[in-house]
């Protein structure tokens, strides 16, 4: 066609893959009329009939664009439906009156990539190398037109550099049309790099403007020498009995050497291989105080048979010793004094307490408890701690049973039992004094004792409710060798299913729920109500 | 061996005082509580006081209540009646006793001293 | 309250005798027994349920029921000849003592 080179550029259109693009017709009226025109695509310089406007009527010749073509506006766009990288070419409109002009757009077609993939070498870099090993790859797929690759170490890009640092790029073409963008880094790599980060960067276009992504961070295992062995305790901080403790060898070379931990025995002074877990891990537990001592750790590396060994490090698994109280067994008269010395060694300070069992109550700050002016209530337990305030949860304890003598204490007086006649009845009966006492009842019946603590007793009796029962009533004689007392049971006639728990009652009662006879084996259980004040 | 030995006795007019003392060993003293019994000549045995261990806590017969008083000295292993307003009816060998280690009755007794209250 | 023990009582050598002892405190207390020979101070021969202290012989021993006490010599010995008292704590439940009248033990 005559003067086509003075044609000026052609009118620029970008879309991005899968969309639609509008191709808009930029003749003039006085270059020809739109309703009578011509649409080709030029592709390796030749031209291919695409589409027909006669009479404002559109009609896509056969081929690649025969279904994606459409008129628009009125006849001068051309849409082209489901764009791809393949459509990346010129299209022009010719208009055939008055005379033959035409009108240039280049199609420009974009995709933006998948995020990267990145994949560190998996099998490390020794630092040793002589040139540039591969470090990591990186892969960008699907984008369009091929994107720019930038690697960063650090957050800081990485340039070429003679027999420093390689980035080999290859790409391959999708039968979509869509690039796959494949970069290797290769770099030598120093000691330091072991924690360096390294990650990929992919810079692409878009119709928008300019877009980058950018892969995870990675680091890659580097192999260095191992210049240095160490041991390491966990947990840090006082160590006391009882504690699962870690002791690991640590080592500054990768692949660290095989370990061995030694503690130097105290007798001979030799050092002793201890024996370690499957990862090289000594763990004492629960750690004792004879865990205590010397340690350290030889690091073997197997290559080149060069045997490390540590600073040695002393262990102190901190301990509280069983604690001593004396008198062991302390029997009182009621009226006397009472002193009770505590006594535990420790591999530090120790605090002692003094506890009363029964409230935990702290009566003392100190190893010895001084009671004076002993009284009945004054028996039972007294519990001496021994703790390191240093250290918590470091504590051992001694409980001593304190007896003062005097005769037998009922748990009560008098109390009225509320039962039917033919039940096998439940009751119970308690005492205390020292010595123990023993419990006797006087009616016949299946009695079984136990004993409560060292100066307390209870004694419990099945028996069958008949009217002679009814009449006597029950008793508990409770005796030892300074006395003897008594607890009656009261036993009245009721109809059980009167009775509800919240019935009102001026008098000190106890019901019981019975079995009929004819379930003698089941016992009832007393429901305690208010007691008589006196106890006896 | 458990030895109690009185001493203080003696002839005191009435209305006089007098001081009776014992002393104890062979045990631990502060842990008993130690009693005064008296026995008026050809009569049967007469409680009159007890102390505890700690000489926290004392007793008295109601014949002496007011006038007698009990004390110790757990640092001297010592035990004291301090006896006032003596009647002639006070007249009687006192004896120093021991309880049991039960407590509430005697089990060791001294040899006595004899408190006449005579004008 | 009072401890009651009849005077005086006799045994014919190598026989069995019984010396009782009354009161409202023995219901809850057990009896001690005391020996006593002229010129001579109390010496326990029983205590408790029935427990003598070391030294002293087995034919001595004690027992109780309701408000009595009562001491027993099994087979008596010239040498029991002696005054017993029996002696508990009050009745009222504080900390005073009582003693028994005594009973003048006579063996023929």
């Known amino acids: 066609v005559p003067g086509e080179a003075e044609q000026p550029a052609p009118e620029l259109v970008e879309v991005e893959v899968g969309s639609t693009a509008l191709l808009k017709c930029g003749l003039s009226q006085s270059q020809g009329n739109l309703s009578h025109v011509d649409w080709f695509s030029v592709h390796k310089e030749k031209r291919t009939l695409i589409f027909r406007v006669r009479q404002g009527q559109g009609q896509s010749e056969p081929g690649e664009y025969e279904q994606r073509l459409s008129l628009q506006d009125r006849g001068a766009t051309l849409a082209l439906t489901q764009v791809t990288p393949q459509d990346e070419r010129i299209f022009l409109c010719q208009g055939k009156r008055p005379r033959s002009q035409e009108y240039r757009i280049q199609l420009r077609v974009y995709k933006a990539p998948e995020e990267p993939n990145i994949q560190v070498n998996p099998l490390g870099i020794p630092v040793n190398s002589k040139e540039p090993e591969e470090v990591a790859t990186c892969v960008g797929r699907n984008g369009y037109p091929i994107p720019q690759v930038i690697w960063y170490k650090n957050g800081r890009p990485l340039k070429e550099e003679k027999n420093r640092v390689h980035i080999q790029s290859s790409q391959t073409v999708e039968s979509s049309g869509l690039y796959t963008l494949q970069s290797i880094l290769k770099a030598q790599l120093v000691k330091e790099d072991k924690d360096a980060q390294f990650y990929c960067e992919l810079n692409y276009r878009l119709p928008s403007g300019n877009h980058m992504k950018e892969s995870r961070e990675v680091t890659v295992p580097v192999f260095y020498p191992t210049e240095k062995v160490w041991l390491e305790v966990e947990p840090v901080g006082m160590l006391k009995e009882g504690d699962r403790v870690e002791i690991r060898c640590l080592a500054d070379g990768n692949p660290p050497p095989h370990f061995s931990i030694s503690k130097q025995n105290p007798s001979t002074r030799e050092a002793e291989e201890e024996t370690t877990n499957d990862n090289g891990v000594l763990v004492l537990e629960p750690a004792r105080k004879e865990h205590s001592g010397r340690y350290e750790c030889q690091g073997l590396d197997l290559d080149t048979m060069i045997s490390l060994l540590s600073e040695p490090q002393e262990l102190l698994v901190n301990y509280v010793s069983d604690v001593r109280v004396s008198p062991a067994a302390p029997e009182r008269q009621e009226g006397s004094s009472l002193t009770l010395t505590c006594e535990a060694e420790s591999s530090q300070d120790l605090e002692f307490q003094w506890l009363r069992e029964e409230t935990g109550q702290v009566l003392e700050r100190g190893p010895v408890l001084q009671l004076h002016d002993l009284k009945r209530e004054a028996g039972g337990g007294y519990r001496c701690v021994a703790s390191v305030p240093s250290i918590p949860g470091l504590n051992r304890t001694q409980l001593v049973n304190v007896a003062i003598f005097g005769p037998p204490w009922m748990a009560f007086k008098e109390r009225k039992v509320w039962v039917k006649e033919n039940m096998v009845l439940n009751l119970s009966c308690e005492a205390s004094g020292h010595p123990r006492p023993t419990i006797s009842w006087n009616v016949n019946g299946t009695a079984s004792e136990q004993d409560q603590d060292p100066q307390r007793v209870l004694s419990t009796l099945n028996v069958l409710v008949t009217p002679e029962l009814l009449e006597t009533g029950v008793e508990c004689t409770a005796s030892n060798d300074l006395g003897k007392n008594t607890s009656i049971l009261f036993l009245e006639l009721v109809n059980l299913t009167t009775l509800t728990p919240d019935s009102n009652t001026t008098t000190g009662l106890s019901t019981s729920t019975a079995s009929p006879h004819t379930r003698a084996n089941s016992t009832s259980t007393e429901r305690k109500l208010p007691e008589p004040e006196s106890r006896g | 061996e458990v030895q109690l030995v009185e001493s203080g006795g003696g002839l005191v007019q009435p209305g006089g005082s007098l001081r009776l003392s014992c002393a104890a060993s062979g045990f631990t003293f502060s842990s008993y509580a130690m009693s005064w019994v008296r026995q008026a000549p050809g009569k049967g045995l007469e409680w009159v006081s007890a102390?505890?261990?700690?000489?926290?806590?004392?007793y008295y017969a109601d014949s002496v209540k007011g006038r007698f008083t009990i004390s110790r000295d757990n640092s001297k292993n010592t035990l004291y009646l301090q006896m006032n307003s003596l009647r002639a009816e006070d007249t009687a060998v006192y004896y120093c006793a021991k309880d049991h280690d039960y407590g509430g009755f005697i089990d060791y007794w001294g040899q006595g001293t004899l408190v006449t209250v005579s004008s | 309250s009072e401890l009651t023990q009849d005077p005086a009582v006799s045994v014919a050598l190598g026989q069995t005798v019984r010396i009782t002892c009354q009161g409202d405190s023995l219901r809850s207390y057990y009896a001690s027994w005391y020996q006593q020979k002229p010129g001579q101070a109390p010496v326990l021969v029983v205590f408790g349920k029935n427990n003598r202290p070391s030294g002293i012989p087995d034919r001595f021993s004690g027992s109780s029921s309701g408000n009595t006490a009562s001491l027993t010599i099994t087979g008596a010995q010239a040498e029991d000849e002696a005054d017993y008292y029996c002696?508990?704590?009050?009745?009222?439940?504080?900390?005073?003592?009582?003693f028994g009248g005594g009973t003048k033990l006579t063996v023929l």
């Open positions: 002696h508990s704590r009050d009745s009222s439940g504080t900390h005073l003592r009582v």
């Open positions: 102390i505890s261990g700690s000489g926290g806590s004392t």
